[in-house]
């Protein structure tokens, strides 16, 4: 596709080179059952996603690998997730105490940008909870959607402070998106 | 900036065949007081919209009709809502079991597809949260967006788990969109 | 507008003015440190804004001045923000007597529009929360966005109801956009 | 009810192309992908290739890559398979099938709807 | 691409008796493992799904189980209509691939 740049003729009225919406970067990545996976200490774990089955695509050269949105083109996109949490409270201190508990303090979703030039990870978008719930069983989505300036060849994926606690049952659920602009 | 009325040359450089963004299928929809309506048991009723007074409107075919917004045009759409819900947690437990509770155990909001050529909805987005209030009072919104791939004749609706508990007091709590990306 | 069945001229192929969607008016600002400022007792006081550092950007001719986002172009905008609330709760009722305290009864984000022919601001959006946390430290964010006809010269700002309780810690905890669509 | 129609018998030529339609009625067409199985006389099934209703995007197994192409045309809620360059081994009665997915992280499904099947004679 | 390896080839049995098919993969297809019968002249119909799940309409008689690299289908107590060809599929990576049946016949 033409990229934006190479304009056109000599008289006045000017006009964009072909870029059909339809021909934008699109994906919509929808929760699988995760595999537990070794990640270090401070590091959130990184979910993988459904990206063909059901209401899940990528389309026009958005490509879905290894837990990662590779970017193809350079521009602005919006990019968005949705992760619901649950777990069960016990309510009893030595439960509580006895192994990790299924109800954490706090319960968080980060999607974030890895550019291979740069050795570090750049957090574009967090959203965190504490988590007071009483009752025995909890549930609650966290969703996160805003535009960034993304390069060719970045790559996107979403972090979750527990794996163990994601709703992977329905694809409506928990899922991840972006689209170019 | 040109509008998209004046039209072009003849010669070689590629241009995109007419599609101005502004004429693109667009709608936001503002919640209204809702009639209690008679619905299935397992079945979440259907919210009702306002389509054309204050921040609403539809544009470009896009069609609000009977509860649901009608896709005008196949393509990818993204597609939104917040519900705001609000009780009064009644204490005591007396008062909880005469008649229904205004403190349910959660609250959800579906966004559903419907296709007419297929009698099962397809759902789309879910929202759903435990509720563990313990003030008299409380409120929250649920928030959704996320993008789809929609066929022309395809039919949105908002579901909700208790259509009694949505707040419709204002335009900019309870909200539902669509638009052509 | 033309409605997309009505197109031009007596050749065969239509072709559009240029519109490339890079040089659409877009921004994502994100949050800064707020100085406590004056303001009347029923009016939620308006964030500011980090709008050229890190994550954030104006750009084609969307600028930011003031609190305020000033559209440069009447259409259709996509406007979201987040804001990421955080507090102490003080258990004790004596504490929570002597002066204000940290844990409040509700939260409430708003994005409103101004516009200056018009005396009366227009609330767009709002993310409202009752605050019912027990833990001694609470934190959560309410996120917001949807789509709106904006006409050139509007501006737009985000209101909180508690300006003591907004995270201004990290860019990606708190921030506000919009991009015309 | 659920189910898939296929197009009727092929007799081809060698080095000829056949194009087999499957139409489905009873669901949701963009929301499940069409599998091509083709079973030649007393063998096995075998996988020929998926394309997602949803946004076209394809698999094909190894052996028919670059000779196979499968399409769907959602508003006629019909999908197609096109073999080219046929050779007597392609000789096969070829099914299409639904890809059910249950909406959920937890589960893959199986191909739950067949088509009655088409029989595609390559001989010259 | 993922190889699946039926056994046995054959199985005769007789009705009432009880039927155990084997289905290894060449590597971890995880719990993504489809089982399907079919008859003569008759198209494929799905039986089990993701290893252990009935499809609707499946009689209970019908089983799955494993996960990993080895499933087993069992048929607690054969029937005259179950004798038939039954094939392992694996949806667990590109290509989709079946394994080449086992034929259930009558001793």
């Known amino acids: 596709a033409l990229k934006g740049q190479e304009f056109a003729p000599s008289h006045q009225q000017v006009y964009a080179p072909l870029r059909a919406d339809g021909d934008k970067p699109r994906a919509h990545l929808t929760v699988v059952r995760q595999t537990p996976t070794q990640h270090f200490k401070n590091q959130f774990p990184a979910l993988h996603w459904e990206h063909e089955l059901g209401l899940a695509f990528t389309k026009n050269r958005m490509n879905y690998t290894n837990k990662f949105l590779l970017i193809p083109e350079s521009g602005d996109y919006f990019i968005y997730s949705q992760v619901t949490f649950r777990g069960m409270t016990s309510e009893s201190s030595e439960i509580r105490q006895a192994g990790r508990p299924n109800k954490p303090d706090s319960i968080t979703v980060v999607i974030t940008k890895v550019t291979d030039s740069y050795p570090e990870p750049t957090q574009l978008l967090m959203g965190t909870k504490s988590v007071s719930e009483v009752g025995s069983n909890w549930f609650q989505p966290i969703y996160l959607g805003a535009m960034f300036s993304l390069q060719e060849g970045d790559k996107l994926m979403v972090n979750v402070s527990d794996i163990s606690l994601v709703d992977y049952t329905k694809e409506d659920k928990t899922f991840f998106g972006a689209f170019l602009l | 900036a040109l509008k998209g009325q004046e039209f072009a040359p003849s010669h070689q450089q590629v241009y995109a065949p007419l599609r101005a963004d502004g004429d693109k299928p667009r709608a936001h929809l503002t919640v209204v007081r809702q009639t209690p309506t008679q619905h299935f048991k397992n079945q979440f009723p259907a919210l009702h919209w306002e389509h054309e007074l204050g921040l609403a409107f539809t544009k470009n075919r896009m069609n609000y009709t009977n509860k649901f917004l009608l896709i005008p045009e196949s393509g990818d759409y993204f597609i939104y809502s917040q519900v705001t819900f609000r009780g009064m947690t009644s204490e005591s437990s007396e008062i909880r079991q005469a008649g229904r509770p205004n403190k349910p155990d959660s609250i959800t909001v579906v966004i559903t597809k419907v296709t007419d050529s297929y009698p099962e909805p397809t759902q789309l987005l879910m929202g759903t949260k435990s509720v563990s209030e313990v003030g008299s009072n409380w409120f929250q919104p649920i928030y959704l967006g996320a993008m789809f791939s929609l066929q022309e004749g395809d039919k949105l609706m908002v579901n909700v788990s208790d259509i009694s508990l949505v707040d419709y007091t204002k335009e900019d709590k309870t909200f539902f969109g669509a638009f052509l990306l | 507008a033309l409605k997309g069945q009505e197109f031009a001229p007596s050749h065969q192929q239509v072709y559009a003015p240029l519109r490339a969607d890079g040089d659409k008016p877009r921004a994502h600002l994100t949050v800064v440190r707020q100085t406590p400022t004056q303001h009347f007792k029923n009016q939620f006081p308006a964030l500011h804004w980090e709008h050229e550092l890190g994550l954030a950007f104006t750009k084609n001719r969307m600028n930011y001045t003031n609190k305020f986002l000033l559209i440069p172009e009447s259409g259709d905008y996509f406007i979201y923000s987040q804001v990421t609330f955080r507090g102490m709760t003080s258990e004790s009722s004596e504490i929570r007597q002597a002066g204000r305290p940290n844990k409040p009864d509700s939260i409430t984000v708003v994005i409103t529009k101004v516009t200056d022919s018009y005396p009366e601001p227009t609330q767009l959006l709002m993310g409202t929360k009752s605050v019912s946390e027990v833990g001694s430290n609470w934190f959560q964010p309410i996120y917001l966005g949807a789509m709106f006809s904006l006409q050139e010269g509007d501006k737009l700002m985000v209101n909180v109801s508690d300006i003591s309780l907004v995270d201004y810690t990290k860019e990606d905890k708190t921030f506000f956009g919009a991009f015309l669509l | 009810q659920v189910q898939l129609v296929q197009s009727g018998a092929e007799v081809k030529k060698p080095g000829a192309s056949v194009k087999v339609s499957c139409k489905a009625s009873g669901y949701d067409f963009t929301y499940y992908g069409i599998s091509w199985v083709r079973q030649a006389p007393g063998q096995g099934l075998e996988w020929m290739g998926w394309?997602?209703?949803?946004?076209?995007?394809?698999h094909y197994a190894r052996m028919l890559q670059g000779r196979v192409t499968m399409t769907t045309d959602t508003s006629t809620r019909t999908a197609y398979m096109e073999l080219r360059s046929l050779r007597s081994d392609d000789t096969a009665v070829y099914y299409c099938a639904r890809e059910t997915y249950y909406g959920s992280g937890a589960y893959r499904g199986g191909m739950d709807v067949w088509g009655q099947g088409t029989t595609v004679t390559v001989s010259s | 691409e993922i190889v699946l390896t039926q056994s046995p080839a054959t199985l005769s049995l007789s009705p009432g008796e009880r039927a155990t098919l084997s289905c290894r993969a060449s590597q971890s297809v995880s719990s993504y493992l489809a089982w399907y019968q079919q008859k003569p002249g008759q198209a494929p119909r799905l039986l089990i799904y993701d290893a252990s799940n009935r499809a609707t309409g499946i009689p209970a008689r019908f089983s799955g189980s494993g996960s990993g690299t080895d499933f087993t289908l069992t048929i607690s107590s054969l029937e005259p209509e179950d004798f038939a060809v039954y094939y392992c599929?694996?949806?667990?990576?590109?290509?989709?691939?079946f394994g080449q049946g086992t034929k259930v016949e009558i001793k």
């Open positions: 394309i997602s209703t949803y946004n076209g995007n394809t």
């Open positions: 599929q694996q949806r667990s990576n590109w290509p989709w691939t």
